[in-house]
């Protein structure tokens, strides 16, 4: 399963789409910056087996997909870009699911790293709470867009390390 290679390209396409989605000048949003507590340690360890690593990445993509599929998101972003972004994420999710099924026969370790997946879930809960508290303002969405771009970039490093391990 050559997921890291294909996923890395998909990740890059998703990042480009995210970058294009900006609607307002981020310079007006500086005071809305927020510490979402990206679970960096979940993407630092080399202890993961491949299937476990993929399951953590899958959770991150799934949560991003959920976040950008809300009606509040649809009201904020340009529709055609949002659709392309969602399609890209959906493709990545499908690739990952197929890859995990392939890996299960190869590895004897548990399929999922429950603690890591929970950490990713809680991270996205903090993002959703922030948006709610900020009443889904344009600046709040701009801060979240920047945060998701950063988390995608950090997970990309994780994927590259995973590819080197193969």
């Amino acid at each position: 399963c050559d997921l890291p290679q294909t996923h890395s390209l998909g990740n890059r396409r998703a990042l480009i789409l995210l970058a294009q989605m900006g609607r307002i000048s981020p310079f007006s949003c500086l005071k809305d910056r927020h510490d979402f507590g990206f679970p960096q340690e979940e993407f630092d360890g080399n202890q993961f087996q491949k299937a476990q690593a993929i399951s953590v990445l899958h959770e991150m993509i799934q949560q991003t997909f959920n976040l950008f599929s809300t009606k509040d998101s649809s009201a904020t972003w340009e529709q055609s870009l949002l659709e392309k972004f969602s399609t890209e994420l959906n493709q990545q999710l499908n690739d990952m699911e197929a890859c995990v099924i392939q890996e299960v026969g190869v590895e004897e370790t548990p399929l999922m790293n429950v603690d890591s997946i929970l950490a990713v879930k809680k991270y996205f809960q903090r993002i959703t709470l922030y948006l709610t508290e900020k009443k889904y303002s344009p600046c709040a969405w701009e801060v979240v867009r920047a945060e998701i771009m950063r988390s995608f970039s950090l997970s990309k490093i994780f994927q590259e390390r995973l590819r080197r391990k193969e």
């Epitope: 981020p26 310079f27 949003c29 500086l30 005071k31 910056r33 510490d35 950063r150």
Partner: antibody
Amino acid sequence: EVQLVQSGAEVKKPGESLKISCKGSGYSFTSYWIGWVRQMPGKGLEWMGIIDPSDSDTAYSPSFQGQVTISADKSISTAYLQWSSLKASDTAMYYCARHPGLNWAPDFDYWGQGTLVTVSS
Amino acid sequence: DIQMTQSPSSLSASVGDRVTITCRASQSIDGALNWYQQKPGKAPKLLIYFASSLQSGVPSRFSGSGSGTDFTLTISSLQPEDFATYYCQQSFDFPLTFGQGTKVEIK
């Protein structure tokens, strides 16, 4: 290794134009903003303005608005600061520094070495 | 614009002394404050960000505190390499603004 490398010292006459540069390496250039800071001889730090290299959006300090132009060329990971007509009072050390944008990360964590601009007739 | 006022503007201290520099903002900036150290002929160096977070590679003798309008940089035990000028800077809103600097000299 993250680096911001600035162009060399310049000696100019009043009324001349000038463009100094700041080249980033060792990180994703479009993921960070680049700010410019002036330090006149024996004085403190003054923020001039900032650019988002991903789309060349800029913001200026009111003190420098209309006096300088900040630009960037993301294809060569370089930001610029330029004057169309220099004055003697522009004599200073100019620093570029990277800023994390809207991310919760250290501000101005890496700085260029500085470009000394001397304007004298 | 948000004005940043540092005090004192200069101070004399000895190696081993505890040194405190204060910075006051003209309006609340939450915790959006950074501290920099600058030595003659060198670029500024980030010490503390978001009021109290120690930048990677900076010795633990440096610490920052405060929120709202009043902030403090503390050097718990001054070392010979700490003699320099220190600047605070607000990163709450544009235009970004620096304090006028505090020069720490050898007594």
